[in-house]
């Protein structure tokens, strides 16, 4: 048996993936647990095995179909249950009626590349991955640049309030190594959150030309 409080949080990536984390304060023995998704108006249901990510939390990804297929719409409600095996039976540990498009977290942006670099500026582009066509252009981005001697947490956030998949970084120092990350968030959804940060893109500004003011 399990005592203590539990928290069950899930996000939809807007296409074919629901990622869930279940946290349980009470001690769990070596019990097999899973998340079960049952849409209210679809012919399919889906299950994933919860795997430990820390002492008291477990995570899994419900793969609903091909990565770019639109498996749920804004009208769908999905009943999500955490089920844990107790002997020969499954016990419901947590349950929620999940509105996918109110609980969005997109995939991290991909394909970051330097379009053009100079001594003091750098133009960078990226792509969004597995994002629904429903959003049209109504997405926003946050970006950050890691400077030498600083941490990511210290990096100021740059906000792009529209679907703009590029940025021109200004006032950089010549001949300096930087790293860059970006994340994305739809405007839609009361409990929508930012995507994970993209993989960092490393780049170096060009050296200042000798004998010239820069």
């Amino acid at each position: 048996a399990v005592n203590g409080t539990s928290q069950f949080t899930c996000f939809y990536n807007s296409r074919a993936n629901i990622s869930c984390v279940w946290s349980q304060d009470g001690a769990l023995q070596d019990t097999s647990c899973q998340v079960h998704a049952w849409p209210d108006r679809r012919r399919w249901n889906q299950t994933c095995e919860l795997l430990p990510v820390s002492q008291a939390s477990w995570a899994c990804n419900l793969i609903l179909g091909a990565p770019d297929s639109q498996k749920l719409t804004t009208v769908d409600i999905v009943t999500l249950r955490v089920l844990c095996r107790e002997g020969v039976r499954w016990r419901v540990m947590a349950i929620q009626d999940f509105k996918p498009f109110e609980n969005l977290r997109l995939m991290a942006p991909i394909s970051l590349q330097v379009v053009h670099v100079e001594t003091h500026r750098c133009n960078i582009s990226w792509e969004i991955s597995q994002a629904s066509h429903y959003f049209e252009r109504h997405l926003e981005f946050e970006a950050r640049t890691l400077s030498p001697g600083h941490t990511w947490e210290e990096a100021p956030l740059l906000t792009l309030k529209q679907k703009q998949e590029w940025i021109c970084l200004e006032t950089l120092t010549p001949d300096t190594q930087y790293e860059f990350q970006v994340r994305v968030k739809p405007l839609q959804g009361e409990f929508t959150t930012w995507s994970p940060w993209s993989q960092p893109l490393a780049f170096r500004t060009k050296p200042a030309a000798l004998g010239k003011d820069t």
């Epitope: 639109q70 804004t74 066509h133 429903y134 959003f135 049209e136 405007l187 839609q188």
Partner: antibody, heavy 117, light 107 residues
Framework: EVQLVQSGAEVKKPGATVKISCKVS????????IHWVQQAPGKGLEWMGW????????EYAPGFQDRVTITADTSTDTAYMELSSLRSEDTAVYYC??????????WGQGTTVTVSS | EIVMTQSPATLSVSPGERATLSCRAS??????LHWYQQKPGQAPRLLII???QSISGIPARFSGSRSGTEFTLTISSLQSEDFAVYFC?????????FGQGTKLEIK
């Protein structure tokens, strides 16, 4: 430039069926969602339904579900709305519009349908 | 279904003045509220999404705000082209529903 061009005005008898077309340009029709909205004379707007061309799915408002059919022809970039069993209360302007599911970003010019015996 | 109530039905304001239009939802709709403008003989035009996000190309004098289930569209300094009917629409609960409209007329 995004454009939605609707077919012309229609006069129909009660009990008949009307089918309105909405020809789009300026965006990728195959990855779009097209809504239909009714506006009766002197009244507000009423959302009727949508077709999601990528998912191949339709959604209808309960008040229209039994009588409306929304289709699309991706070879001609045209959406259609068919309303059957017409009655006098269906006299209205009907709009097609492109958007995400939640709001309507671009609208057609409207098609007037008059139902009269 | 959710009922959207707009007030007032008609609002008379002088050019250059501020106009405040209200839209109330019959239940909580988070920020899933959108505003449209419709001029006579024309289709509606999307102005603001999610209560307060302006659509690109819409003049900065149009702004939106929310307090609970009450949403407000403010036009800071009315221009002659702003006199029209304004509709709100919710997208929180299916089916989507519109308010009955507020007619903004010249005083």
């Amino acid at each position: 430039e995004v454009q939605l061009v609707q077919s012309g005005a229609e006069v129909k008898k009660p009990g008949a069926t009307v089918k309105i077309s909405c020809k789009v340009s300026g965006f990728n029709f195959k990855y779009s969602l097209i809504h239909w909205v009714q506006q009766a004379p002197g009244k507000g707007l009423e959302w009727m339904g949508w077709i999601d061309n990528e998912a191949g799915e339709t959604e209808y408002a309960p008040g229209f579900q039994d009588r409306v059919t929304i289709t699309a022809d991706t070879s001609t970039d045209t959406a259609y709305m068919e309303l059957s069993s017409l009655r006098s209360e269906d006299t209205a302007v009907y709009y097609c519009a492109r958007g995400g599911p939640w709001f309507l970003s671009y609208w057609g010019q409207g098609t007037t349908v008059t139902v009269s015996s | 279904e959710i009922v959207m109530t707009q007030s007032p039905a008609t609002l008379s304001v002088s050019p250059g003045e501020r106009a405040t239009l209200s839209c109330r939802a019959s239940q909580i709709i988070s920020n899933n509220l959108h505003w449209y403008q419709q001029k006579p003989g024309q289709a509606p035009r999307l102005l603001i999404i999610y209560g307060l996000q302006s659509i690109s190309g819409i003049p900065a004098r149009f702004s939106g705000s929310r307090s609970g289930t009450e949403f407000t569209l403010t036009i800071s300094s009315l221009q002659s082209e702003d006199f029209a009917v304004y509709f709100c629409q919710q997208s929180n609960n299916f089916p989507w529903t519109f308010g009955q409209g507020t007619k903004l007329e010249i005083k």
